[in-house]
């Protein structure tokens, strides 16, 4: 439909309905985790409200089991935060020791899974070292960005200790994505 | 108008207007805090420039008394950052002193009121301990997410200590909102 | 097109057409920089890569010389995450050596040229003051807002210290823009 | 493993159009950008373009923009390069040849297919 | 586009010798590569990244260079390096080849 610009100006082009309010759109927000078996050196995936609260998904934008279902193909504005919160790091018990000095760190990644390859796609990744000097820390890391992404794509968030992330209030870890 | 996908291929379906330029969206910029009196547990709420420099609110997108006004119901993507800034945070202090190592906090908050309903709901939050070391520190919160909102609801955006926002410049401390 | 929410209700009014999909869009991602020459208190901007991987543009918005092109006039939403990394700050430095205790620091800022004008207009920024007590250290900084571009602006992201960017994953460090 | 496997040799008339197909395996297709690149006999290697699987973006060679077109579908892990307004000096074996990043290089090549321009 | 010129264009080459391959870009480059080519067979990467060794290949390889001015070199010629050797920029579309090097054994 590109060069339409150049249509004189008494000749109005429309276009094929994409209303507005019918695109596919999702915001999660976080629940208590249930510890779950993950493999070792793979980041375990956060479980969401999809429906109570803040929470909802529409026009076939669907959430089971961890997935954000893609229901249409095209660019999408995915997003997250997930707010993290722990105890003195071990990167300040060994600098105290005098072990060497290797920070923790935290991650978030949103990884996209395509049925017809096994291996995932990390479309987003936060990571921050943890090496804080009080007793108790917390903070957020939010992620952001546009993707193509194909009809029947699943999204997820995983996160590198699921034991830190702070699941208290919904407005503190999220994730959502909505077609462009 | 879902399911119109089956509309047969000759049969072109239009949508009713809704031209993305006519759409109400918002972008608000940091000005200098007048101190106000806030109920202790309440966080203040920030005021904001709405139209000059790179700040603007069009096609019905009000800004008035700290709040954004939401002039039609439908999904919006709400946005902000709040740069902090501050001296050796009382954490390091009580550290050094030996008493219980309480970390400080920073905290902003994007709230909707809806006049119908008496208390506000937390829509976002980003907070995060602040335990530095260095005599002076300064720091960002972003936040980002896609709400349901309501003709008439407002917006505003609250901070745990209004001093120490950062309103030098437009560009480290802002707040958005457009329609989807 | 304003007022016509005031048209009879028989009357179906439909919007000259902005299909969705025909919208300038780009995700760019990190690639390894290549040392250059920038001026004194001016910070160096990145390159990206714009059609491998997650990166891709579209729909005339194009990418040459570290810089994205704006097609066409209208409202856009513009991010990015520059993902940082360096060894024990300066900061934990000078305050072990009892010497006064600046932070160092990394920033971000989204800036805008415009050929008409001389002067870069700095869009967004992030900065955070560094003072890491670990031996190395790795933080994000996220930003995203919407601006009002012209026909022939163009963007690019300017960081403090380009030694310091993570250019190992495409999904650490990343910049986008898209027309609303 | 990582396999390319391209469709077969086709003998075509001057002005014709050649499609030739590559099918992916072993690897996720949309994560890796697919080139085409083509071999004149005893001649050097000649990029033709690129096309991303992931976003459907394509950069072609000045070239031969105009002439040829590439293609995907996901669906399949296959990867089409389709060439028109054939001449005789687009006698040649042609290859699909797919990359992660650019500092990786082209990692992965097809078999090769060879079209032959004669009338 | 960047014009990759290499050479020598032909070596021949006695097993066990060092041979010493360069690639010369008409602009500065940032990413190069390097491919072998056997008579009849696809091109293989070698080099990837200026001086990484591509996945399964023997550490006699070896690649360098900056800027405009890259070398790929074979420590030690075995009989079954005889190939046709070509270098690739992909700095600047149209990601170009060089002219190649045909090494011959002895």
């Known amino acids: 439909l590109k060069g339409q610009e150049f249509a004189p100006s008494h000749q109005q082009v429309y276009a094929p309905l994409r209303a507005d309010g019918d695109k596919p759109r999702a915001h999660l927000t976080v629940v208590r985790q249930t510890p779950t078996q993950h493999f070792k050196n793979q980041f375990p995936a956060l479980h969401w409200e999809h429906e109570l609260g803040l929470a909802f998904t529409k026009n076939r934008m669907n959430y089971t089991n961890k997935f954000l279902l893609i229901p249409e193909s095209g660019d999408y504005f995915i997003y997250s935060q997930v707010t993290f919160r722990g105890m003195t790091s071990e990167c300040s018990e060994i600098r105290q020791a005098g072990r060497p000095n290797k920070p923790d760190s935290i991650t978030v990644v949103i990884t996209k899974v395509t049925d017809s390859y096994p291996e995932p796609t990390q479309l987003l990744m936060g990571t921050k070292s943890v090496c804080e000097v009080g007793s108790n820390w917390f903070q957020p890391i939010y992620l952001g960005a546009m993707f193509s992404l194909q009809e029947g794509d699943k999204l997820m968030v995983n996160v590198s200790d699921i034991s830190l992330v702070d699941y208290t209030k919904e407005d503190k870890t999220f994730f959502g994505a909505f077609l462009l | 108008l879902k399911g119109q996908e089956f509309a047969p291929s000759h049969q072109q379906v239009y949508a009713p207007l809704r031209a993305d330029g006519d759409k109400p969206r918002a972008h608000l910029t940091v000005v200098r805090q007048t101190p106000t009196q806030h109920f202790k547990n309440q966080f203040p709420a920030l005021h904001w420039e709405h139209e000059l420099g790179l700040a603007f609110t069009k096609n019905r997108m009000n800004y008035t008394n700290k709040f954004l006004l939401i002039p039609e119901s439908g999904d919006y993507f709400i946005y902000s950052q709040v740069t902090f800034r501050g001296m050796t945070s009382e954490c390091s202090e009580i550290r050094q002193a030996g008493r219980p190592n309480k970390p400080d906090s920073i905290t902003v908050v994007i709230t909707k009121v809806t006049d119908s309903y008496p208390e506000p709901t937390q829509l976002l939050m980003g907070t995060k301990s602040v335990c530095e070391v260095g005599s002076n520190w300064f720091q960002p919160i972003y936040l980002g997410a896609m709400f349901s909102l309501q003709e008439g609801d407002k917006l505003m955006v609250n901070v745990s200590d209004i001093s120490l926002v950062d309103y030098t410049k437009e560009d480290k401390t802002f707040f958005g909102a457009f329609l989807l | 097109l304003k007022g016509q929410e005031f048209a009879p209700s028989h009357q179906q009014v439909y919007a000259p057409l902005r299909a969705d999909g025909d919208k300038p869009r780009a995700h760019l991602t990190v690639v390894r920089q290549t040392p250059t020459q920038h001026f004194k208190n001016q910070f160096p901007a990145l390159h990206w890569e714009h059609e491998l991987g997650l990166a891709f543009t579209k729909n005339r918005m194009n990418y040459t010389n570290k810089f994205l092109l704006i097609p066409e006039s209208g409202d856009y939403f513009i991010y990015s995450q520059v993902t940082f990394r360096g060894m024990t700050s300066e900061c934990s430095e000078i305050r072990q050596a009892g010497r006064p205790n600046k932070p160092d620091s990394i920033t971000v800022v989204i800036t805008k040229v415009t050929d008409s004008y001389p002067e870069p207009t700095q869009l967004l920024m992030g900065t955070k003051s560094v003072c890491e007590v670990g031996s190395n250290w790795f933080q994000p900084i996220y930003l995203g807002a919407m601006f009002s571009l012209q026909e022939g602006d163009k963007l690019m992201v300017n960081v403090s210290d380009i030694s310091l960017v993570d250019y190992t994953k495409e999904d650490k460090t990343f910049f986008g823009a898209f027309l609303l | 493993q990582v396999q390319l496997v391209q469709s077969g040799a086709e003998v075509k008339k001057p002005g014709a159009s050649v499609k030739v197909s590559c099918k992916a395996s072993?690897?996720?297709?949309?994560?890796?950008?697919m080139n085409w690149v083509r071999q004149a006999p005893g001649q050097n290697l000649e990029w033709i373009g690129l096309?991303?699987?992931?976003?459907?973006?394509?950069n072609y060679n000045q070239k031969f923009k105009g002439r040829a077109t590439l293609t995907v579908d996901t669906s399949i892990s296959t990867a089409y390069m389709e060439l028109s307004r054939l001449r005789s000096d687009d006698t040649a074996v042609y290859y699909c040849?797919?990359?992660?990043?650019?500092?990786?290089?082209?990692?992965?090549w097809g078999q090769g297919t060879l079209v032959t321009v004669s009338s | 586009e960047i014009v990759l010129t290499q050479s020598p264009d032909f070596q021949s080459v006695t097993p066990k010798e060092k041979v010493t391959i360069t690639c010369s870009a008409s602009?500065?480059?940032?990413?190069m590569h390097w491919y072998q080519q056997k008579p009849d067979q696809s091109p293989k990467l070698l080099i990837k990244?200026?001086?990484k060794l591509a996945s399964g290949v023997p550490s006699r390889f070896s690649g360098s260079g900056s800027g405009t001015d890259f070398t790929l070199t074979i420590n030690s010629l075995e009989a079954e390096d005889a190939a046709t050797y070509y270098c690739?920029?992909?700095?600047?579309?149209?990601?170009?080849f060089g002219g190649g090097t045909k090494v011959e054994i002895k």
């Open positions: 096309i991303n699987p992931y976003s459907g973006g394509t």
């Open positions: 602009s500065s480059v940032n990413y």
């Open positions: 040849a797919s990359i992660y990043q650019r500092h990786d290089g082209i990692a992965y």
């Open positions: 072993g690897y996720s297709f949309t994560g890796y950008t």
């Open positions: 990244d200026t001086s």
């Open positions: 690739q920029q992909w700095s600047s579309s149209p990601y170009t």
